[in-house]
Amino acid sequence: WPPPGTGDIVVQAPTQVPGFLGDSVTLPCYLQVPGMEETHVSQLTWSRHGESGSMAVFHQTQGPNYSEPKRLEFVAARLGTELRDASLRMFGLRVEDEGNYTCLFVAFPQGSRSVDIWLRVLAKPQNTAEVQKVQLTGKPVPVARCVSTGGRPPAHITWHSDLGGMPNTSQAPGFLSGTVTVTSLWILVPSSQVDGKSVTCKVEHESFEKPQLLTVNLTVYYPPEVSISGYDNNWYLSQNEATLTCDARSNPEPTGYNWSTTMGPLPPFAVAQGAQLLIRPVDKPINTTFICNVTNALGARQAELTVQVKEGPPSEHSGMSSN
């Protein structure tokens, strides 16, 4: 805006206008005329920087003339009216339409007044995120993949993770000319602790009101990690039966549990029930090491636990298990 009292006419337009590939967009351009100022506009002209000639002209007496009549249209200019609004609509936006345009009013007696507008041609990307299922490799591998397809300009991808790791981002031409597909991989050394945890892919693009967040639940395949619980070192003779539990974490899930001892098969007082081992009351002290062997698709792992059943005052203990 000019300072008050200058009495000058001013062309008003945004410095930048975004439009979407394939859509239509209006390049707004208005002549602001102070209240007392007399002006007469005989012509509106749109031209593109670096190109000779005009792409659109509206003449007071001849009306509109377009370089591409099917793609251009003056929004408000009409014959027989004051020419104050030079806004131009462009249809079927193409990548090559991006650039600097000049909107010019030929006004009398103030002369030609113009303004430049930068047209940004955008393409809204489609975003997907997916897990990359991995095994324990011992070295960094991609565990999640985030893809922003067909963006213009290219989308910006970042990752949020509490697990450590690093991104590996690449770009490739999109399906439509001038668009870009961005692929970002989240890379880390797989471990069983990572399995089931999540990382978040954040995609930023000027066509979005706010960043898009895509959460990926990670999958790491690993053989069973086995431990045995249920024994508290305080088991005594002539007390109630007790239970040992074979605790196994694995992906995929365990397919089988096998109980044994270091001496071979289970003794008669030990009965296997899947992941649990039932220890019946015994009448003499024992000192036995139990083995639980757990199998899944990736292999078998086992854990050992030595159980001692001791002599002791039964009145103080209600069973062989502290549970």
């Epitope: 007469h40 005989s42 007496t61 009398f108 007696p109 002369g111 007044r113």
Partner: antibody, heavy 121, light 109 residues
Amino acid sequence: QVQLVQSGAEVKKPGASVKVSCKASGYTFTSSYISWVRQAPGQGLEWIAWIYAGTGDTNYNQKFTGRVTMTTDTSTSTAYMELRSLRSDDTAVYYCARHGMTGRGWYFAVWGQGTTVTVSS
Amino acid sequence: QAVVTQEPSLTVSPGGTVTLTCRSSTGAVTTSNLANWVQQKPGQAFRGLIGHTNNRAPGVPARFSGSLLGDKAALTLSGAQPEDEAEYYCILWYSNKFVFGGGTKLTVL
């Protein structure tokens, strides 16, 4: 070349009207702005009005509003200025001037030779 | 009613430089006043020299230049020629009308 040729001298009585013509040649008449200016004997130049030849759109000096009418005939590329209710102080040389564009601004480019209007009883 | 004031007369030596000024009664002259300068030689039609403060008309010698000088519009003639002897008028725009100055009679002597 661009030329503006005005009609001949006029002698009018007070209260009468006068219509001065300005025939243009050498350029596209319909896309031009033409101003009318007068100079009374011993006085300075005084702007009366302008007209856009293509549409007949006008802007008058408020001093003359209601007494002056500007028109154009695009078929003959001629601009007209009619001044009514003539008074003795309307005695002056009346000029038409075509505005041209230089750079991004207008200027008083080409002038007619002037038409002397004498108002006398 | 705005009044536009010019020097009634000025004299310049051939090859010399002279500046004609144009003052507005309403305050400082700005680019919004669209200062124009026209020339009238004795017995000849008016001729436009400058438009829009500083835009020289086609065919006008480069020795003529328009500008704003302080709070006035100015026409500077650098390297005056005998044929530049003429009456020079300044014209200012005031939102809805043009106002002419009284003219400056320039003598090249």
